[in-house]
């Protein structure tokens, strides 16, 4: 048993049929030592008397709020939550599995820039009764301060039958230097409780691997005098880390109709233009990526081959 | 040589061009690595990420661009020295910073040279002859630091009279062929930004 | 199977004009770029120019420009390439090549010899 | 025109050993970037795309790698069916243009 916060215990439990659970001693936070009795959540059923109680915590009905009166009047809370551990692996059951960029994959995190800033979130089909606490670092055996946010919920989706909740977070490292060469990753931690279950995830990266830039803006297009080409050009995102030529990026230029089967012109820049062949009802798309460290592609910014 | 900074053609900015193919030689490097050590720990999440040059040269600091100087967190370990010669350097006016940024960039490159070339007598002596270091990239090494052109004390190759661990020896490659991609990347973009300056 | 299906060799006489079909077959021929290169005996490949057979829309190579002429007519799935003015240094192989990305060639025909010879 | 240069232009090699051919470009063509391997009497055959992707059914000892002006084809260990001609092509710019060709004879 371990303290999440204050007045709230974690019980790591191992999970399987009649497994024997694990016997907690709670202990009444007050000065006095007589006429104390102990209740479970709304109920009224005394469990016991004395400053401290022992339970044998096996399953989720021994979890919940327990606490001490004297004489009608609350002294104390201890809240109890349970981690499951089934075959020696703590379980996963609040978040989804993104499976992206492997199985397991319950934290995303992507970055825009160098600076030291990046959002995680993750997914989840619980709507209610739902708690996130998020705390990150750099490194873990002398841990270098990042700052999180508090986790809100950022989208609501319909997948099939059930709907879909996506969380996120905002985080910052507290004193991080865009050049810098990182040696130790970024560890994310978010305690997930949901009633009365407690789970952990987390997630280890390099900001430059989880670098994903904005797409490119100001997209622009001038037909060339006699030709089928056209000449496209376009800006750095704003909020790509500066200066631009030192944090440089490389573009991929696409003309494509609305099919992602249909025929396309394709073509690779280190500059922010580009002469492509146009097509009737297609699209001219620009999209960014890290020039020299490839980490994702930012997504397509687009304007209408006409 | 002496060519001058201020110009967008690479053919002009030799060192560019070099660093280019530098980034292009480990990278390529680093997946044959991989592909060829699958059963050993050798991806970013595997390996411990060290830093043959920690405390030896100062590359981030002293090539930092002059726009991320105010950035307080950039500036912890800025130091100073007094080589100024080579040819990547625009003219005798070229900034102290830009000098001590070069032989600092330099002075890496032949750490590793003698780390990599280290590291391959041991891998040849592997009866497994599993995995050599790409002859490409040393002689990429090798180009850079002649563009660049610095006078320095030559550092004698290691010589071990041990038996190598070759299991050890691989995981050692991995870890070198990560750092030094991870410098080859700030190596590219400090002479992408000397080249637009 | 996606297959191009070149027409038989020619023989020319310099001055005069050739044209050379290419019939694809397997997947909707509207869908693929269209394009022409050459290669003259124990030479390198040298591109000519693409049709998108959607809509007739063409490009050639500038040394090709106004000798060169390609069409295509969706009801055949069939590209032609005509060349005019031919002179021996003309003598090649012609290769029709289609994908659906503009700038490079994942089909090929088998090849056309012309030999444009007096 | 962006002028493709190969070299070797003829490259010996035995059987089971590997094989690189190098092609630069006249002016920076990011990773725009095709080889093609052609037989005689054969058309080509397209076996890397931009630079370094490979094309389903082209054996994995084909490799590309390169972007900007330099790069490099690199088969990992010859079989007797990979002796063939061998063009690079740029798509940076219209006029498409190829290089001369590498001709890998058996050593």
């Known amino acids: 048993i371990w303290e999440l916060k204050k007045d709230v215990y974690v019980v790591e439990l191992d999970w399987y049929p009649d497994a024997p659970g694990e016997m907690v001693v709670l202990t009444c936070d007050t000065p006095e030592e007589d006429g104390i009795t102990w209740t479970l959540d709304q109920s009224s059923e005394v469990l016991g008397s004395g400053k401290t109680l022992t339970i044998q915590v096996k399953e989720f009905g021994d979890a919940g709020q327990y606490t001490c009166h004297k004489g009608g009047e609350v002294l104390s809370h201890s809240l109890l939550l349970l981690h499951k551990k089934e075959d020696g692996i703590w379980s996963t059951d609040i978040l989804k599995d993104q499976k992206e960029p492997k199985n397991k994959t319950f934290l995303r995190c992507e970055a825009k820039n160098y600076s030291g800033r990046f959002t995680c979130w993750w997914l989840t089909t619980i709507s209610t009764d739902l708690t996130f606490s998020v705390k990150s670092s750099r490194g873990s055996s002398d841990p270098q301060g990042v700052t999180c946010g508090a986790a809100t919920l950022s989208a609501e989706r319909v997948r099939g039958d059930n709907k879909e909740y996506e969380y996120s977070v905002e985080c910052q490292e507290d004193s991080a230097c865009p050049a810098a060469e990182e040696s130790l990753p970024i560890e994310v931690m978010v305690d997930a409780v949901h009633k009365l279950k407690y789970e952990n995830y987390t997630s280890s990266f390099f900001i430059r691997d989880i670098i994903k830039p904005d797409p490119p803006k100001n997209l622009q297009l001038k037909p060339l005098k006699n030709s089928r080409q056209v000449e496209v050009s376009w800006e750095y995102p704003d909020t790509w880390s500066t200066p631009h030529s030192y944090f440089s990026l490389t573009f991929c230029v696409q003309v494509q109709g609305k099919s992602k089967r249909e025929k396309k012109d394709r073509v690779f820049t280190d500059k922010t233009s580009a002469t492509v062949i146009c097509r009737k009802n297609a699209s001219i798309s620009v999209r960014a990526q890290d020039r020299y460290y490839s980490s994702s592609w930012s997504e397509w910014a687009s304007v209408p081959c006409s | 040589r002496n060519l001058p900074v201020a110009t967008p053609d690479p053919g002009m900015f030799p060192c560019l061009h070099h660093s280019q193919n530098l980034l292009r030689a480990v990278s390529n490097m680093l997946q044959k690595a991989r592909q060829t050590l699958e059963f050993y720990p050798c991806t970013s999440e595997e390996i411990d990420h060290e830093d043959i040059t920690k405390d030896k040269t100062s590359t981030v600091e002293a090539c930092l661009p002059l726009e991320l100087t105010k950035n307080e967190s950039c500036l912890n370990s800025r130091e100073t020295s007094f080589i100024t010669n080579g040819s990547c350097l625009a003219s005798r006016k070229t900034s102290f910073m830009m000098a001590l940024c070069l032989s600092s960039i330099y002075e890496d490159l032949k750490m590793y040279q003698v780390e990599f070339k280290t590291m391959n007598a041991k891998l040849l002596m592997d009866p497994k002859r599993q995995i050599f270091l790409d002859q490409n990239m040393l002689a990429v090494i090798d180009e850079l630091m002649q563009a660049l052109n610095f006078n320095s004390e030559t550092v004698p190759q290691k010589s071990s009279l041990e038996e190598p661990d070759f299991y050890k020896t691989k995981i050692k490659l991995c870890i070198l062929l990560h750092a030094f991609r991870i410098r080859a990347v700030t190596i590219d973009r400090v002479m992408s930004y000397l080249n637009a300056s | 199977q996606v297959q191009l299906v070149q027409s038989g060799a020619e023989v020319k006489k310099p001055g005069s004009s050739v044209k050379v079909s290419c019939k694809a077959s397997g997947g909707t021929f509207s869908d693929y770029y269209l394009h022409w290169s050459r290669q003259a005996p124990g030479q390198g490949l040298e591109w000519m120019g693409w049709i998108d057979p959607e809509n007739g829309d063409t490009e050639y190579a500038p040394k090709f420009q106004g000798r060169v002429t390609i069409t295509a007519d969706e009801s055949t799935s069939t590209a032609y390439m005509e060349l005019s003015s031919l002179r021996s240094e003309d003598t090649a192989v012609y290769y029709c090549?289609?994908?659906?990305?503009?700038?490079?060639?994942?089909?090929w025909g088998q090849g056309t010899l012309v030999t444009v010879s007096s | 025109d962006i002028v493709m240069t190969q070299s070797p232009l003829s490259l010996p090699v035995t059987p089971g050993e590997p094989a690189s051919i190098s092609c630069r470009a006249s002016?920076?063509?990011?990773?725009?970037l095709h080889w093609y391997q052609q037989k005689p009497g054969q058309a080509p055959r397209l076996l890397i795309y931009f630079a370094s992707q490979s094309i389903s059914g082209v054996p994995s000892r084909f490799s590309g790698s390169g972007s900007g002006t330099d790069f490099t084809l690199t088969i990992s260990s010859l079989q007797p069916e990979d002796f063939a001609t061998y063009y690079c092509?740029?798509?940076?710019?219209?006029?498409?243009?190829f290089g001369q060709g590498t001709k890998v004879e058996i050593k």
């Open positions: 090549a289609r994908n659906k990305e503009l700038r490079y060639f994942d089909v």
């Open positions: 092509q740029q798509s940076n710019s219209f006029p498409l243009t």
């Open positions: 002016q920076s063509i990011s990773i725009n």
